[in-house]
């Protein structure tokens, strides 16, 4: 309706002596700003002077008037949207209706609201859900209808008079739509405070109890159940009675059914409280409890281990591990069922007892081929003495024992000849399968643990033979020993030890790097003609002729070997030198003379030197020395030099004939 | 201290004859020990060895194949000089013409004393 | 008879080590152990540096140093200086009528 004006708040505010009131409040005037306000109690409109009547509580007007009451209430509002009043401390008689009487410019309007004060703190009220389960989570909510800026309240909760561990969120509300402090608790409830007082208790700031609210606790939850038996300890032996029963000690509704359970599986035709075990076997031994049903569902009590206690039955040996190898260790264990448990073993190898072992583990560190065989033992405890079982075999696995490389072949053996050899051994488990042989060759087997070396070679010093099941055993190498002729034979300078000079000492060495037999004989040999016997060729002053090629011979009872032949370089000085001339010794004026310079020398001449008949050296380097044109006067005795890195060496003298041409004599 | 000092003409028409002169000072020219050459160096190709004149018990020459019909060096005993003739120069013969001392070092011989050279161009 | 053969250029900073090689044959230097070696600065007659193995003239530094193997000579200048900036050349003995040949020549600079 839009001739009404507009206003938001609570309808009504609860509060007690001497607390305080906050009215949170919206409005919207007609037409302009408020001009005049003033808070009635309990208003009455009187039609005679078309005003209203009752205590005015504030008042705000043009000329600005307040009464005093003004100090306890207060118009928290403003001209055109808050209208927010406080009254503090709010007393029992300020109860019933407060009318907010408002004037604008030409519209006015009264707006009423409750207000309820009580005499003392009125009780929070406590929400639950409406059902509640053990160990579910539940949010348990405490509220109360009051909240105040200036009055500062606190809520808590208490069970069984304790306060509460959990820890609660306090939320307030001071709003147009709702004004309220709440309080809630998250709170996982146990089967145990089904029936317990829950209290929430409204405090002042200094935790002053002001009033409070108190619920009992309704948990649903299955059956809480405890079990007895006779005897106590639950230890018989076979053909004793045994009783147990079953004694519910809370539930919630009321329990239905009742069972019994062994080892996790119901016993059939047993619903009552108490299960009566008559003649009881070893196959009643186990852990039992009993099941008691409710609409939440089944509750089952602690187990009890009923222990019927016989002697041990036949016994069975377990090997860890076999087959077992040679060296490793194996481990017997002897399994027996008994109750109690076996005290005492007694233990079989091939049916004799093994002294000393009396525990239901054997270990051996370290198994040997005797330790195969049949394991058997026997268990003991209070009730009695077992069965000795069937017994267990254990395989002990090796590598073939003793190998030997055998060689088949008559001695001496000589290369090129054919080899046989054959691999033995003494004892294998599992079966040998296969050989190998040391070094590898492309060698035959004709037959399983036989070797054939065709055309044998000198170096074949040693072979051995592996035997090989899973694993592989060699035998130590056997020594072929096989004869040859000398190998490697070279020619070797012993001295001088740097190049070989014209009238040097030279040793020549014949080596060879093995010969078997060791027995050996030398020869030297140059051009096809033999020099010598020794292992050493010896020249006291070597001269030129000796350079040729030398070969030696060294041979044995099996044969003889040559060496590469070896060149012998003698070096020396320029020798049988000469100067030759060309086109002859007589030449004619002008025309040109060659002078060679001829020689024999190793190394060959490297520098060459010229000089006339006074001994003049002329600046020619070459072997050649030509001169061109040729003149009269160079007629005469020339001679060269040569030299190397030995030496020199000088020619004699050659004579140079140079005559007049025909011109000149004919000019004379 | 040696010294070689060369004269002659800077410039010498195509066909007739090139000559230069060089005067020894220090040394003679017939000094059993050295011999008197004559290299020539032109941009195309480089350094040239001509000739060479030198006494021993005698008066030799040694000319280079290449102008060995056209190339005569004398020596001058009476004025201690050395000289060099080309005959029927071509343009080809332009070069810097030098003289030079040939000694020798240990074995073999070089060139240790050079003259200040002479620069010939032929053209008509 | 053919010239010996150079590189054209070498180049060094101060202080660094050059080496010019001067390639012939088995007719001349691999036939003596003779290699002469020239130094040239423009406008100047050659100067003899070096000779056969390491006969140097009065007054060369021993900076210069030459090697030679089998139809190669080396010419190496240690401790180069701005003055060694000049065309070096080579020079052999032959066994032909050309009784001694030169190098092309190698133009050194000193950076």
């Known amino acids: 309706d839009s001739s009404k004006w507009v206003f938001e708040h609570p309808e009504t505010l609860y509060a007690w002596e001497g607390a305080c009131v906050w009215i949170p409040c919206t409005y919207r005037a007609l037409d302009g700003d408020l001009e005049s306000f003033i808070l009635f109690h309990n208003p009455e409109y009187n039609k005679n002077t078309s005003k209203f009547d009752g205590t005015r509580l504030y008042e705000s007007t043009k000329d600005g008037k307040v009464p005093s009451e003004q100090k306890r209430v207060q118009f928290l509002g403003d001209k055109n949207k808050n209208c927010t009043l406080s009254i503090h401390p709010v007393h029992l008689n300020d109860s019933g209706q407060l009318g907010l009487r408002m004037e604008s410019k030409t519209e006015k309007w009264m707006e009423r609201i409750h207000l309820n004060v009580s005499e003392r703190p009125f009780p929070p009220h406590i929400q639950l859900p409406p059902e509640i389960q053990e160990s579910q989570e539940v949010t348990l909510t405490c509220l109360l209808n009051f909240s105040c800026y200036g009055y500062p309240i606190q809520l808590q909760w208490l069970l069984e008079g304790v306060p509460m561990r959990q820890a609660a969120v306090t939320s307030t509300s001071l709003t147009i739509k709702s004004v309220f402090t709440r309080s809630e608790l998250k709170f996982s409830p146990q089967w145990s405070h089904h029936g317990k007082i829950v209290t929430c208790q409204l405090q002042d700031a200094d935790g002053k109890f002001l009033s409070n609210d108190t619920v009992q606790l309704n948990v649903k939850h299955t059956p809480k159940l405890e079990i007895k038996v006779t005897p106590s300890d639950a230890i018989v032996r076979e053909g004793d009675s045994v009783t147990m029963t079953c004694e519910v000690s809370s539930s919630n509704p009321e329990y239905t059914t009742v069972s019994w359970l062994k080892d996790g599986t119901s016993l059939k035709k047993q619903n009552t409280f108490t299960l009566n075990l008559r003649e009881v076997t070893k196959d009643q031994s186990g852990k039992y409890c009993c099941q008691v049903s409710n609409d939440v569902g089944p509750g089952r009590s602690e187990e009890v281990f009923l222990q019927v206690q016989y002697a041990p039955e036949p016994s069975t040996v377990q090997i860890l591990h076999s087959p077992a190898v040679e060296g490793s260790q194996v481990e017997f264990l002897c399994m027996s069922l008994a109750n109690p448990l076996p005290t005492n073993y007694t233990w079989y190898h091939n049916g004799k007892e093994m002294q000393g072992r009396t525990e239901e583990k054997v270990h051996i560190p370290k198994i040997l081929p005797w330790h195969a065989g049949t394991y058997s033992c026997v268990a003991e405890n209070i009730l009695g003495t077992g069965q000795r079982g069937p017994g267990a075999e254990l395989d002990v696995q090796y590598p073939p024992k003793k190998v030997t490389t055998v060689i088949q072949n008559p001695m001496p053996i000589r290369e090129g000849d054919t080899v046989t050899l054959s691999c033995n051994y003494n004892s294998s488990n599992p079966s040998v399968t296969r050989y190998e042989w040391k070094p590898h060759g492309a060698w035959e087997e004709p037959s399983l643990g036989v070797l054939k070396i065709q055309n044998v070679g000198w170096d074949n010093t040693t072979i051995a033979c592996a035997a090989c099941n899973s694993w592989c055993s060699w035998a130590s190498p056997v020594a072929l020993n096989v004869q040859y002729a000398p190998r490697d034979v070279r020619v070797r300078k012993i001295k001088p030890l740097s190049e070989i000079h014209s009238g040097n000492s030279v040793s020549l060495q014949c080596d060879f790097s093995s010969s078997h037999p060791k027995e050996v004989q030398f020869f030297w040999e140059k051009n096809g003609r033999l020099l010598g016997k020794e292992s050493q060729l010896n020249f006291d002053s070597i001269s030129p002729e000796d350079a040729g090629s030398y070969s030696c011979w060294v041979n044995n009872s099996i044969g003889q070997t040559a060496s590469k032949a070896w060149t012998l370089e003698v070096l020396y000085a320029p020798r049988r030198l000469r100067v030759s001339m060309s086109p002859g010794d007589q030449v004619m004026e002008g025309k040109s003379a060659t002078l060679t310079c001829e020689s024999d020398a190793n190394p060959p001449v490297s520098h060459y030197t010229w000089f006339d008949w006074n001994n003049q050296s002329l600046p020619y380097h070459s072997q050649k020395l030509r001169l061109e044109p040729v003149k009269v006067q160079h007629s005469g005795a020339y001679w060269c030099q040569g030299t190397n890195s030995v030496g020199k060496g000088r020619s004699p003298l050659s004579t140079l004939t140079v005559y007049y041409s025909p011109e000149t004599i004919g000019r004379r | 201290e040696v010294q070689l000092q060369q004269s002659g003409p800077g410039l010498v028409k195509p066909s007739q004859t090139l000559s230069l002169t060089c005067a020894i000072s220090g040394d003679s020219v017939s000094n059993n020990n050295a011999a008197w050459n004559w290299i020539r160096q032109s941009p195309s190709r480089g350094l040239e060895w001509l000739g060479r004149t030198y006494h021993r018990s005698t008066w030799y020459n040694d000319y280079v194949g290449s102008v060995k019909s056209r190339i005569t060096i004398n020596p001058d005993t009476s004025k201690n000089q050395f000289s060099l003739q080309l005959n029927s120069v071509t343009p080809e013969d332009t070069a810097v013409y030098y003289c030079?001392?040939?000694?020798?070092?240990?074995?073999?011989?070089?060139?240790?004393?050079w003259g200040q050279g002479t620069t010939v161009t032929v053209s008509s | 008879q053919s010239a010996l053969t150079q590189p054209a250029s070498v180049s060094g900073s101060p202080g660094q080590s050059i080496t010019i090689s001067c390639t012939g044959s088995?007719?001349?230097?691999?036939?003596?152990?003779?290699v002469s070696w020239y130094q040239q600065h423009p406008g100047n007659a050659p100067k003899l540096i070096i000779h056969?193995?390491?006969n140097r003239p009065s007054g060369v530094f021993d900076r210069f140093s030459v090697s030679q193997s089998g139809n190669t000579a080396s010419l190496t200048i240690s401790g180069l200086q701005a003055e060694d900036e000049a065309d070096y050349y080579c020079s052999s003995h032959t066994t032909t009528s050309t009784l001694y040949v030169f190098g092309t020549g190698t133009k050194v600079t000193v950076l």
């Open positions: 030079a001392r040939e000694t020798d070092y240990g074995d073999y011989g070089a060139f240790d004393i």
């Open positions: 056969g193995v390491n």
């Open positions: 088995r007719n001349d230097i691999g036939a003596y152990e003779s």
